[in-house]
């Protein structure tokens, strides 16, 4: 039985040209996290973090994505095209798969403030 819940940074906004941290956290389960996958709204993989083997950043994002902090992901040099949904998928044993959603809005405005909060989707 899957008892865990994914907490995410929820809906966030960040300035064009800036950077943003995408964070998910799995709680309320003793399941072992074997892998965390980060994906973009169009089903493109940004990165994979295998618990034992480490990080891989996918080719389309290798210049703009940095692993961490923790199991999170830092997206840099933001463009307007980065606006949209991002998903963290936690592969766990023995529970199975947990998925969290983050919505990122990239703002043109130079006064846009980065807002982030943890929330349960």
């Amino acid at each position: 039985m899957m008892t865990g819940t994914i907490e995410t940074t929820g809906n966030i906004s960040a300035k064009k040209g800036g950077s943003v941290i995408l964070q998910c956290h799995l709680s309320s389960t003793m399941a072992q996290v074997t892998q965390v996958n980060w994906e973009q709204h169009d089903h493109s993989l940004l990165a994979i973090r295998n618990a034992e083997l480490g990080w891989h950043i996918y080719p389309a994002f290798k210049d703009r994505v940095a692993p961490g902090p923790g199991l999170g992901l830092t997206l840099q040099s933001l463009t307007m095209n980065d606006t949209g949904e991002y998903f963290c998928t936690y592969h766990t044993y023995p529970d199975g798969t947990y998925r969290g959603r983050i919505f990122l809005e990239v703002l043109e405005s130079s006064v846009a403030e980065h807002s982030a909060r943890f929330q349960i989707p």
């Epitope: 994906e39 493109s44 083997l53 480490g54 891989h56 080719p59 290798k62 592969h91 798969t97």
Partner: antibody, heavy 119, light 107 residues
Framework: EVQLQQSGPELVKPGASVKISCKTS????????MHWVKQSHGKSLEWIGG????????SYNQRFKDRATLTVDKSSSTAYMELRSLTSEDSAVYYC????????????WGQGTLVTVSA | DIVMTQSHKFMSTSVGDRVSITCKAS??????VAWYQQKPGQSPKLLIY???YRYTGVPDRFTGSGSGTDFTFTISSVQAEDLAVYYC?????????FGGGTKLEIK
């Protein structure tokens, strides 16, 4: 040029163990994950597990977890796979292979080591 | 475990033809798919990764596409040296798995 050189063929008895080596040359050994893949005669490929040479971290296919052990000797740029309690089902070619920079696809492969389990 | 199904075990084609090999995942695998070529008596060779990037030195007649659960590998103009078995491979979720292979035969 990156090369993965595997040890030679093995003929082993049922119940015994085998340890296969894979020496990397032509690149920094610790930069990439190393993996082992099984190919039974005329069959497809089966991932056994992978290893991070930097920290010795291992990820196993649950099917092999109890019988396979992946290790590494950084000083000689060599990865090892030990397989225990062998049966005829383990007769196969075993490949070591190296991950790419970008993802967990396998860019370089050893020549394969044929393991035959027979009484 | 995620099962990668290559519906055709064999495909027969002629030199110069265009041929497409399909691979279907039993569960969602995003874009974590690669394609390998294995010629008789040789080790597999990476052709396509992620799943539309050509690996270094791979001729541009080889292409890949797809995301989610459905993937396609295409040879735009088959050459005699393309006689081989082609495998798809997912690394979205461990254990990473391979398709059963499609053997390309030249008429």
């Amino acid at each position: 040029e990156v090369q993965l050189q595997q040890s030679g063929p093995e003929l082993v008895k049922p119940g015994a163990s085998v340890k296969i080596s894979c020496k990397t040359s032509g690149s920094t050994f610790t930069e990439y994950t190393m993996h082992w893949v099984k190919q039974s005669h005329g069959k497809s490929l089966e991932w056994i597990g992978g290893l991070n040479p930097n920290n010795g971290g291992t990820s196993y296919n649950q099917r092999f977890k109890d019988r396979a052990t992946l290790t590494v000797d950084k000083s000689s740029s060599t990865a090892y796979m030990e397989l225990r309690s062998l049966t005829s089902e383990d007769s196969a070619v075993y490949y070591c292979t190296r991950g790419t920079y970008y993802d967990y696809s396998f860019a370089y492969w050893g020549q394969g080591t044929l393991v035959t389990v027979s009484a | 475990d995620i099962v990668m199904t290559q519906s055709h075990k064999f495909m027969s084609t002629s030199v110069g033809d265009r041929v497409s090999i399909t691979c279907k995942a039993s569960h969602y695998v995003s874009t974590a798919v690669a394609w390998y070529q294995q010629k008789p008596g040789q080790s597999p060779k990476l052709l396509i990764y992620s799943p539309s990037y050509r690996y270094t030195g791979v001729p541009d007649r080889f292409t890949g596409s797809g995301s989610g659960t459905d993937f396609t590998f295409t040879i735009s103009s088959v050459q005699a040296e393309d006689l081989a078995v082609y495998y798809c491979h997912q690394h979205y979720s461990t254990p990473w798995t391979f398709g059963g292979g499609t053997k390309l035969e030249i008429k």
